[in-house]
């Protein structure tokens, strides 16, 4: 069966939106008015992985682009990147682990934990206009909580 996907946007708990700031980079900043259409639309695919009531494995692709968020070691540090894939083979139910995030819902907020690197989360900075990154701390200065907005196909 084909993998189930939905289109959505994400905002951090400070209401910063995510935009493409480079060919393989996202950043977070406050958008308003017509600028809102600049925000990235994700195709969130529900993939194979360890699942529980509040933890669902997903892959985060960029809608209509052959790009997926992935987690890799760079200079011995878990790092978030946008990775180009062959569109003939993606999305698929059994995604490689670097593409998988555990979507965790707590108090109507979402966290995205790397399946490859447990306790590392998709994060944004408090500061405006900074890259989206993989952070190893929760509840500190950096933001790991998001809300999801559904987008029609």
């Amino acid at each position: 069966a084909p993998v189930r996907s939905l289109n959505c946007t994400l905002r951090d708990s400070q209401q910063k939106s995510l935009v493409m700031s480079g060919p393989y980079e996202l950043k977070a900043l406050h958008l308003q008015g017509q600028d809102m259409e600049q925000q990235v639309v994700f195709s969130m695919s529900f993939v194979q992985g360890e699942e529980s009531n509040d933890k669902i494995p997903v892959a985060l692709g960029l809608k209509e682009k052959n790009l997926y968020l992935s987690c890799v070691l760079k200079d011995d540090k878990p790092t978030l990147q946008l990775e180009s894939v062959d569109p003939k083979n993606y999305p698929k139910k059994k995604m490689e682990k670097r593409f998988v995030f555990n979507k965790i819902e707590i108090n109507n907020k979402l966290e995205f934990e790397s399946a490859q690197f447990p306790n590392w989360y998709i994060s944004t900075s408090q500061a405006e206009n900074m890259p989206v990154f993989l952070g190893g701390t929760k509840g500190g200065q950096d933001i790991t909580d998001f809300t999801m907005q559904f987008v029609s196909s």
Epitope: V19, G22, Q38, E64, K65
Partner: antibody, heavy 120, light 110 residues
Amino acid sequence: EVQLVESGGGLVQPGGSLRLSCAVSGFSLDVYTMTWVRQAPGKGLEWIGYIWSGGSASYASWAKGRFTISKDSSKNTVYLQINSLRAEDTAVYFCARVKMISNIETFDPWGPGTLVTVSS
Amino acid sequence: DIQMTQSPSSVSASVGDRVTIKCQASERIYSGLAWYQQKPGKRPKLLIYRASTLASGVPSRFSGSGSGTDFTLTISSLQPEDFATYYCQQGVSSSDIDNVFGGGTKVEIK
């Protein structure tokens, strides 16, 4: 109101360099990626490259090396530096704002263009 | 490396005619296509984005269709102000690309 105005074109000798400017107003270069496109006399549109909102640049494969796109967000200006100019670089050079609508890159609006003529 | 091929390169038509311009991508670009109109000595103007969405202020006689690799721009009833050159543009990838634009189609008076 969103506006873009190119400047810096003119007559240049082969082998020379030129820096074109694109002054923008009505939006932020921290939010929007910008692109440069050129059009040789009587020819079609030719994409040169992007300066992304984060500051990195992407280029058409033929433009890598001699062309450099940069920006100064505090001056609301985007630049195109062209080195080792050749006769075939003679063209109208346009800048345009890149709208990412559902991740799809669309060029709107465009500046009026600036003419670069390379001749001895 | 996505390449965009536009056809025909020119078309002669009369006022009131239905005109169809085709654009083909060398690989799948989903709905990532825009169409532009350019008149001599002027800047290009966005007509259609995301393959079929009309840009603000564009008359409804213009329409776009297609997805994947094959796209079409249709002018249902050609008006005098529509004589111009039309370009398609892929908006999906900027990596290892020669040109995001098709070669253009000139719509001339018959």
